[in-house]
């Protein structure tokens, strides 16, 4: 029988034993930074090369007894999850192990840094195919460890790490908090976040996705043919490292940004019970469980987008929050969210030659989040067009006036503390899809992009009576690039994209005493690329 | 040579106290620093520390990913180390754990 975790990551309509070929991931090398491992275990023999790298602290305690099987336990299991012959995800992937954790599973930031440097030097001396680095470890937030991960990622290496087992915000830990790293939380057979004793999987905006991480069967270092069940975000990260190896083996030219977008795209959506997470983290935590793509062929024709949340701005009057896309992603839209509803909107602005999404807190607000919609759009040329507050009853409007440019997102930003709520909602005049409309006291920013074959359309869903949540989704074949609310009045908490759905949140009606005239409309901009679709068809 | 005007090197340490490893520090140098400069900066720290009666040990010189070095020294020397040329920031070593 197939272990539940391998079944779970196999796409529907496939059997896991058919789907996971013995050579899956064979073009990829996976580096494992962990404990020592039993590399001659039947599950992994010939698949794992133990490097001579070792940088570990002394074990704690005077009476510590160094028992080989205990020393090897964590690393052996993870190597088995990645590439084990019976219970591995990428059965053909070859692995290299570096020892950075001692027999108690403890290491240092400096030892991990030296390990990452060792990998970079090995890559320079003997360039091979795609590299995946698995970091099944966590420490407190570390600027230097995050910086090293960033450098290695920019050298073309895919880094996958454990979100951490502290039932806490993953952004407080490293390398989980490094934006360039793929950070993985753990779920169980019931798609619940994993509880580990009194703690459990980490969560929050620094988690990219979840993967199976409870009762995972893998190689046991107790004997050369033994198996054992282990749990943790390390096991979850090992699944994603295996899936990444499979994807990179099928498409070796994938960049880190393309790989991350595909991992998100092929994940199971909205299956995790979010009630397990603290209330303030639910909206920030991705509801995604990793899965293998349904085909080993590329999905190059898709327009891939993901949502990136900023850190919380903090409560000061002038506080702002910034959300950034990865270097080879395009920022196609920008929105903001505040739990108190006190915000001054958001704007797209250039920073270091790249667009970022900045959200503004308002006086008395508890803080805001900026939400960037980051997409893979080859040969894109995007710019932001701004209209200052119109002060006219018609409201402010801005459109994409350059030839061949299409509207991908709308943002609005206001200087006044409170946009009037008594004004009637502004409705978009029909037949003008290429423009953003907003409150007359707000500046409106349109994201306008030119890319081969890019086409976009506006989709709206308005509810006459105020609701806590209004949603509008893009249909099959279209990708959500922009999500905003009409009007931008103060009872709107904000707008954000969840997968292909635009969500607009309003304050609880019972506490605001709102009237029915304050209807809220969710405005989605849905795009697709005919160019990518054609290119894909020509390849096949 | 003093650090460039207006750029002050900063010190970082783990927010979780039990995970701190005081006495070992990663000195991170500015992005374009060459290996020879890293080695020179490390030697300079050792020399200045010795003049004050402190023993230091350079455990590793980084290059390839980040320029810098790993040093075993007293925390009393941090102020001195932060004033060295090319220094971007210094981070106290800390523990990481299998997850």
């Amino acid at each position: 029988s197939i272990p539940w975790n391998l079944e779970r990551i196999t796409p529907p309509r496939y059997r896991a034993d058919e789907y996971q070929p013995p050579d899956g991931g064979s073009l990829v090398e996976v580096y494992l930074l962990d404990t020592s491992i039993q590399s001659d275990h039947r599950e992994i023999e010939g698949r794992v090369m133990v490097t001579d790298f070792e940088n570990v602290p002394e074990e704690d305690g005077t009476r510590f007894h160094r028992q080989a099987s205990k020393c090897d336990s964590h690393g052996t299991h993870l190597a088995g999850v990645v590439s084990g012959r019976d219970a591995g995800v990428a059965k053909g992937a070859s692995m290299r192990s570096l020892r950075v954790l001692n027999c108690q599973g403890k290491g240092t930031v400096s030892g991990t840094l030296i390990g990452l440097e060792f990998i970079r030097k090995s890559q320079l001396v003997q360039p091979v195919g795609p590299l995946v680095v698995l970091l099944p470890l966590a420490g407190g937030y570390s600027r230097v460890l995050n910086a090293a991960c960033q450098r290695l990622a920019r050298a073309g290496v895919v880094l996958v790490t454990a979100a951490g087992n502290f039932r806490d915000d993953a952004c407080l830990y490293s390398p989980a908090s490094a934006p360039e790293v793929i950070t993985v939380g753990a779920t169980n057979a019931q798609d619940q976040p994993v509880t580990l004793g009194t703690l459990g999987t980490n969560f929050g905006r620094c988690v990219d996705l979840f993967a199976p991480g409870e009762d995972i069967i893998g190689a046991s270092s107790d004997c050369s043919t033994c198996f054992v069940s282990q749990s943790g975000t390390s096991q979850a990260a090992a699944h994603v490292a295996g899936i990444a190896a499979m994807m990179l083996s099928a498409e070796p030219e994938l960049t880190l940004a393309e790989l991350r977008q595909r991992l998100i795209h092929f994940s199971a959506k909205d299956v995790i019970n979010e009630a397990w997470f603290p209330e303030d983290q639910r909206v920030l935590t991705p509801n995604l469980v990793a899965a293998l793509p349904p085909s080993t062929h590329g999905a190059g024709w898709q327009l891939f987008c993901r949502t990136v949340w900023s850190a919380h701005s903090g409560p000061t009057r002038m506080a702002t929050a910034i959300a950034r896309c990865a270097p080879d992603e395009e920022l196609l839209s920008c929105s903001s969210f505040s739990r108190s509803g006190k915000r001054r909107g958001e704007r797209m602005e250039a920073q270091g030659g790249k667009l970022v999404c900045r959200a503004h807190n308002a006086f008395g607000g508890e803080g805001v989040y900026a939400i960037a919609r980051c997409c893979l759009l080859p040969q894109a040329n995007c710019s932001v067009h701004t209209a200052p507050p119109a002060e006219a009853s018609m409201g402010t409007r801005v459109h994409c006036h350059q030839q061949g440019h299409v509207l991908t997102g709308c943002s609005s930003h206001w200087e006044v503390e409170d946009l009037g709520t008594h004004k009637p909602p502004v409705l978009r005049p029909r037949g003008q899809p290429n423009q953003c409309v907003g409150h007359r006291e707000a500046s409106i920013h349109a994201s306008c992009c030119h890319a081969p074959g890019l086409e976009c359309k506006v989709k709206e869903h308005g509810i006459p009576a105020p609701q806590e949540q209004v949603t509008v989704a893009c249909e099959e074949g279209w990708t959500l690039t922009g999500c905003s609310a009409l009007p931008g009045t103060s009872h709107v908490l904000g707008a954000y994209a969840v997968d292909n759905t635009c969500v607009v949140r309003s304050r609880d009606v019972s506490t605001t005493g709102s009237t029915s005239e304050e209807a809220v409309t969710a405005v989605a901009i849905c795009c697709r690329s005919r160019h990518l679709a054609q290119a894909s068809q020509e390849l096949q | 040579e003093a650090p460039e005007h207006g750029t002050t090197a900063t010190f970082h340490r783990c927010a979780k106290d039990p995970w701190r490893l005081p006495g070992t520090y990663v000195v991170v140098l500015k992005e374009e620093t060459h290996l020879s400069q890293s080695e020179r900066t490390a030697r300079r720290l050792q020399a200045q520390a010795a003049r004050r009666g402190y023993l230091t040990k350079i455990l590793h010189v980084f290059h390839g990913l980040l320029p810098g070095f790993l040093v075993k020294m007293s925390g009393d020397l941090l102020e001195l180390a932060l004033k060295l040329p090319h220094v971007d920031y210094i981070e106290e070593d800390s523990s990481v754990f299998a997850q």
Epitope: D17, P22, Q38, S39, D40, R42, E45, G46, V48, M49, V50, A68, S69, C223, S224, T225 | -
Partner: antibody
Framework: QVQLVQSGAEVKKPGASVKVSCKAS????????ISWVRQAPGQGLEWMGW????????NYAQKLQGRGTMTTDPSTSTAYMELRSLRSDDTAVYYC????????WGQGTTVTVSS | DIQMTQSPSSLSASVGDRVTITCRAS??????LDWYQQKPGKAPKLLIY???TRPSGVPSRFSGSGSGTDFTLTISSLQPEDFATYYC?????????FGQGTKVEIK
Amino acid sequence: QVQLVQSGAEVKKPGASVKVSCKASGYALYNYGISWVRQAPGQGLEWMGWVSFYNGNTNYAQKLQGRGTMTTDPSTSTAYMELRSLRSDDTAVYYCARGYVMDIWGQGTTVTVSS
Amino acid sequence: DIQMTQSPSSLSASVGDRVTITCRASQSINNWLDWYQQKPGKAPKLLIYAASTRPSGVPSRFSGSGSGTDFTLTISSLQPEDFATYYCQQDQDIPPTFGQGTKVEIK
């Protein structure tokens, strides 16, 4: 290149012991254990067990339990298979092979048990 | 232990012939089946692992197929150096067990 070189032929009396050696070279020793397989004259192949270079762990076939001992000496990259209380039906060619995958084989050691 | 049964136990063929040897397991072994070639007085040599994967250096005329309990080794065009005994071996469970062998002789 990757190779396993075994010790020479042995002739033993019933009740005696024999120790066959297998020297490995050309690959990362700790990444594979050594399997032992025997083949009686005109017969098929029979797996006897496996031993680890990494930690000395063993995995014996049930038929061998108690009579055989497999060991390794990583310092000389050599694996050993000792068979005690030899009987005439232990007459066979004894092979060592790399790992459980048995992708590389030694040349074989003929052990003859005869009174 | 899993029993492995090979057929035929021997066969005669000519150079250039297509030869097929079958192997049946007493229970499902997924794709964990290896094929070995053994020449007189020599050690066995791995020809196919995991039912269908050829190690580097093995000529492409050798191919393997099957999964579950029924497996086949095919030599597409028999060459003079292919006259030998062929063994299948299951690698699913410990202990690994071998078929009794198929001797391929010159007609």
